[in-house]
Structure formats: C-alpha cells, structure tokens
C-alpha cells in the first residue's frame, strides 16, 4: 500500500504566440481545481475508462478575476497535494490524466458551473520511494508544470511497496536471514512469505507461497523479462540471445489475477478479466466510489456505494460525459418547432415562438381565426401563423374596421385626379391618357392603345372599370 502524490506548480499560458484568453473575467470570476486519474500500465486508455489505480480532486483555488487588458497570467492554484492512495503493489508503470477545471462564480442562473479547461495525459515509469519527478505538459495554449512521486505507507517498502518492514526485535541486528529495511535502518524486513526464489525486485505476494509479477516480468519466479521483440513460437524460441521467452511455464500459471479475476495469455504477457468493481493489471484495484464525488455540474452519483460496485453519473439535461463534465449545446437538437427560436438558459431551455404558435416547444398551431371576427363583411384568412382579414371594398386595417381612403395610395397615373366613390375610386384622367387608372396614353391619331372605348364614353372622359 502507498500514496501517489501530485504537486501542481503552475497552470498558465504556454510559451510562444497565441496566448489564451483568461478563463475568468470581472463579470465571471472563477477559480480552478484539478483532477488526477491514474491507471496501471502503459496502455493508452480512453479518458472515460476507469481510473483503476485511483483518482483525486484538489481543493478549489482562490477566486480569480482578470484585470482588464492584462494577459492571462499563471492562475492562482489550490493549496496542498493531490493524493491518490493505492491499496496493493505500485505497478511501476502507470498512465495519468490531469484535468484543470474552472468553476464559474458569476451571477448566472443556477449558481456555479464547471467546465473543463485543459486535459493532459502521459505514461511514465516510476519506482516507489524515489525522489519527486518534475514534468511539464501542454494542452493547447495552456501549460501545466507539476511534480509527482509514489511513496509506500509503512510497513511496506521497496520500489513496488511489496516488501514489509517490522520494528527490530533485538537492538543490534535483524533476525537470521533478514536484512535491514533501507532507508529505515532501525527496522528489519519481515520474514519472507513468498514462494521460494520469487524475485524481490520484480515479484510480490499477498499470501504465503505465491509469486506475482510486476508488469514487464513473467515466469514462475518473475525473473524472465517480457520481450517486446517478435518471437517465432507462441512462447518464443529457446535461443536465449533473442531476448524472447523460453518455453516454460505460461504467464497465467499460478493465476496472477486477484479478486476472482480470470487470466488469459496474450502474445506479450497475460490479461486479467476482472469482476465488477475491480480494475488494474491484476484486478488488484477497486474503483472510484460515489463518496469521491465524481459527478460534476449537478450530476447524481448512482451505485458505487462501495468499491465493489462501479458508479454512474445521471447528468442533468444540458450535460453529458461519464462525469457530466461536458456541456451539451441543447439547441443543436433543434427542439423548437415551427421556426421557433431556441434559447439555452443553462438551467432551462426556452423557445421563443413565431406568431401563431405556442407551447413549450412551439408545437401548438393556434387557430388564427378562432374568435377573431373581421368587421364590415371582411373574411378571415389563416396563413403563416398570423390571421389576416380580406376586407370588403371600401374598408381596410387589421380587422377591416377602418374606412379605407381609396385615393390614399395615389392610384391614378399620369396626373389623373382621384375621386372616392361609394363603390371604389374613380380616376379623372389628364388629357391624352385613359384607362381605369389613366395608365394608357391616347395616340395622337385618336386611336387608343386599348380596344375601342366602351360605348358611350369618349377617350379622356373619367373611366370607371368596376
């Protein structure tokens, strides 16, 4: 058992052009916090896969408000270390994900909102008990500087925290066959309980007589390195010079999978299929529980009450991801019908409906003419979500309540004079023009551009075409 410790030194704009905008502003002050996720081995796993070695969240950092016009500085960080306890052996090789999260503290409806600012990932080799390792990782225009180490919790010691130490029984020396426990020289190694000959560097045991191998080693005593070169036979040729495994006991011999996991051989080593709630190369690690608060943005943690059951997050509408960490553009689903305008208010979705439509999603087509009478003999016409009156001659306006001035639009062309008449309008045309709207010139020879004028009317007389 032991603890992986992560110390964040700085988070801010990386070198070079294109400095990122500050994530906080006077209108939207915010503070940072960090999440670390550890997985055993060097496998490239998806960000959403379980943090089989463990995970931790930092405290919130100090509230930060951007100074207008100033470039984004290194942002204020939370105090303290991020600590990820591990229960069993330290695997020696591990993958990490470090996420920088922003908590917005503005007056937006719904209180604090969380959003992921940056995510860095890597794969490292690390011996427990060693010094702090320093690292710099970049995510887009951001740069994260940090240090990390793994340390064993007493009584465990060694590069994998698998050797046990006990206080000396005699003041001067350790018992027969037992070495001092460096660096705790006043303690002695506990009596060996592993299978005789089990490699002290590459093997470990949790029960008497067994020998389990750390990643990269195989064989009954964990003394055979797993080769990355290609081998000809399933377990490699017998030639020791090739670096391949010699024929012999398989990597699943003695079942290296803990907690009821089942072992299957792979070309390079072995693979454990773990029961629900256990993870890791040898099913030695149980996952994050609901007590770790893994669900962001108001997500509810379901299941995961104990390490034997995996949790899931039920996300509020507008968020998704295994930890509700991703904001969804809910308007992209076009929930508003009939041309309504979608507004994502964060705490709720609203549709602004076009005229003639109603309902939360503008799904109700209002009967535009229902209860709407058109006055003075007008008739109601539905269309385009808005009612319209087709008015009888001499009336106008939205409901045909206004007496129309037929001459208001100056309908008589070429200087003709307009007269309002009970049945419409009459144009008195200027000399040389004729037609209902004085639109046709009379030709100099007296012939009009139209067929002959109606009987009884001379060209130039007021024309009334009703």
């Amino acid at each position: 058992a032991g603890v992986f410790e992560l110390q964040i030194h700085s988070f801010g704009p990386g070198p070079g052009p294109g400095a990122p905008r500050s994530p906080c502003s006077a209108r939207l002050p915010c503070r940072l916090f960090f999440r670390v996720c550890l997985k055993p081995g060097l496998s490239e796993e998806a960000a959403e896969s379980p943090c089989a070695l463990g995970a931790a969240l930092s405290a919130r950092g100090p509230v930060y408000t951007e100074q207008p016009g100033a470039p984004a500085p290194d942002l204020p960080l939370p105090d303290g270390l991020l600590q990820v306890p591990f229960r069993d052996a330290w695997p020696g090789t591990f993958s990490f994900i470090i996420e920088t999260w922003r908590e917005e503290l503005g007056d937006q409806i719904g209180g604090p909102a969380w959003s992921l600012l940056a995510r860095v990932a890597g794969r490292r080799r690390l011996a427990a008990g060693g010094p702090w390792a320093r690292d710099i990782q970049r995510a887009g225009a951001w740069e994260l500087r940090f240090s990390y180490r793994a340390r064993c919790e007493p009584p465990a010691v060694g590069t994998a925290c698998t050797r046990l130490c006990r206080p000396r029984s005699a003041p001067s020396r350790c018992g027969p066959g037992l070495r001092p426990c460096a660096p705790l020289e006043d303690e002695c190694e506990a009596p060996l309980v592993c299978r005789a000959g089990c490699s002290p560097e590459h093997g470990f045991c949790e029960q008497p007589g067994e020998c389990r191998c750390l990643e990269g080693w195989t064989g009954p005593l964990c003394t055979v390195p797993v080769s990355t070169s290609s081998c000809l036979s399933p377990r490699g040729p017998s030639s020791a010079t090739t670096g391949c495994l010699v024929p012999g006991p398989g990597p699943c011999d003695g079942n290296p999978c803990a907690n009821g996991g089942s072992c299957s051989e792979t070309p390079r080593s072995f693979e454990c299929t773990c029961p629900r709630g256990f993870y890791g190369l040898r099913c030695e690690v149980s996952g994050v529980t609901c007590a770790d608060g893994p669900c962001f943005n108001g997500g509810l943690c379901v299941g995961g009450a104990d390490p034997d059951s995996a949790y899931i997050c039920h996300c509020p509408p507008g968020f998704q991801g295994s930890n509700c960490e991703k904001r969804v553009d809910r308007c992209s689903l076009q929930p508003c019908r009939n041309g309504g305008l979608c507004l994502d208010l964060g705490h709720a979705l609203r549709c602004r409906c076009r005229a003639g439509f109603a309902g939360p999603r503008c799904e109700h087509d209002l009967d535009d003419c229902a209860g709407r009478a058109c006055a003075n003999g007008g008739t109601c016409v539905e269309g385009g979500g808005a009612h319209r009156c087709s008015c009888a001659l001499g009336f106008g306006g939205r409901d045909c309540r206004e007496r129309a001035d037929p001459c208001a639009a100056r309908p008589c062309a070429h200087g003709g004079r307009c007269y309002a008449h009970f049945s419409g309008l009459v144009c008195a045309c200027a000399p040389g023009y004729m037609g209902a709207r004085c639109e046709f010139p009379v030709h100099p020879d007296g012939a009009s551009a139209l067929p002959a004028a109606p009987p009884g009317l001379r060209p130039g007389d007021p024309q009334r075409y009703l």
């Epitope: 719904g110 943005n297 509810l300 943690c301 705490h347």
Partner: antibody, heavy 118, light 108 residues
C-alpha cells in the same frame, strides 16, 4: 408557469397496487427528470424515484422491488405504480420536477393523499 | 445511504429574530449538493436553496445557505410571519436522494 397535477384513487386496499398519474402542463415533459416523493402523515419527506424522458429511471432501494415509474410523452404525463401496498404506504404523494442544476425539486404538485386500508 | 440529521427539531422564535437551522450528514456530501425546502401546513414543499448556498428564483435574500462537507446551515436573518413553517434539507450528490427529518420554526 409550469403546473403539476397528481391524480389517482385516494383509497387502496392492502396487497393491491397503488397507481398515480402526474400531468404536466405548460412545459414539455421531454426536458427534465420527473420524480415522485411521499410524506406519511405527520412525518418527513421520502424520495420514491425519478424518470427521464429517455427512459432512464432511478428508484429508492427501499421500494425498488415494488415500484414502476413510466412516462407518456404524448400525454405529457408520468406515472407511479407501487405493488403489494401496506398501511405503511399511506402518505401524501407528490410529483415534482427535478431542477436542472442538480437533483433537487423546483416545482411540485399540490399532492394527493392515498390511504391504504381495507 | 447518506443520513441527514436536522437540529433542533423545533425552534421557537419571534418575528424579527434570527433563525439558524442545522443539517448534518452522515458522510461528506460531494460538491455541496444540498438543498433546503420550506413547507407550510397543507402545502407542498418549496425549494429555497440549492448548491448549499444559491437561492432559488423568487426567494428573498433573508434566506441564506452555507456549509460544506458534512455540516450545513440555513439562516433566516429576520423572521417574517410567513416564515413560520417546517424546513427540510435534502442531499442530491449520491443516490438514493435523502431528506432530513425537518426543523419546525414556530412562533414563540
């Protein structure tokens, strides 16, 4: 303003199934989680379960084996069925909308009293 | 499940006085996912506070929520006649959702 209205029988016999419906007006049922909560006479509140329009449900483990929550998008309703009822299930049953910033309850029905008695 | 214990069970105060209600959780509530409700006789509960400290829409600023981890407080700075009611806390970080047993604020 969104309104919730519970409906169902006020009296249920022991060992029978309690069925209640909640009708949502002035909002689409498709945007929220919808929940049932109950309150025995003179006692505190107990969460029963919730449903999302996608079909996701979550039930109180103490009731899970007897509980069914379903949703009818066309009618803008969601329902509760609690089987094998006893006198201990006598309570005011509330339907409520789950708040969009977390699983608190921002809009409640006025509640309906259900008595389990023979 | 997370058990919420509210204290005191009953609080006898006069209008204008300050009320301090406590809600203690049996284990840490993640991300301050705690709400407070007010319930008057014959009525449904009404959401007052969510996220431990954010007031719900239309709630007067005399209601203030605070706390984190396992200890949370609802403070009513100056009691108005309409504030005499039963108050419940509720956690929504971990399923099952649970409520406290309630604190009754009554007129002294």
């Amino acid at each position: 303003q969104v309104q919730l209205q519970e409906s169902g029988p006020g009296l249920v016999k022991p060992s029978e199934t309690l069925s209640l419906t909640c009708t949502v007006s002035d909002d689409s049922i498709s945007n929220y989680y919808w929940s049932w909560i109950r309150q025995p006479p003179g006692k505190g509140l107990e969460w029963i379960g919730y449903i999302f329009y996608s079909g996701t449900t979550n039930h109180n483990p103490s009731l899970k084996s007897r509980l069914t929550i379903s949703l009818d998008k066309a009618k803008n309703q969601f329902s509760l069925r609690l089987s094998s009822v006893t006198a201990a299930d006598t309570a005011v049953y509330y339907c409520a909308r789950v708040f969009n910033w977390g699983f608190a309850f921002d809009i409640w029905g006025q509640g309906t009293m259900v008595t389990v008695s023979s | 499940e997370i058990v919420l214990t509210q204290s005191p069970g009953t609080l006898s105060l006069s209008p204008g006085e300050r009320a301090t209600l406590s809600c203690r959780a049996s284990q840490r509530i993640s991300r301050t996912y705690l709400a407070w409700y007010q319930q008057k006789p014959g009525q449904a509960p009404r959401l007052l506070i969510y996220g431990a400290s954010s007031r719900a829409t239309g709630i007067p600023d005399r209601f203030t929520g605070s706390g984190s981890g396992t200890d949370f407080t609802l403070t009513i700075s100056r009691l108005e006649p309409e504030d005499f009611a039963v108050y419940y806390c509720q956690q929504y970080g971990t399923s099952p959702l649970t409520f406290g047993g309630g604190t009754k604020v009554e007129i002294n």
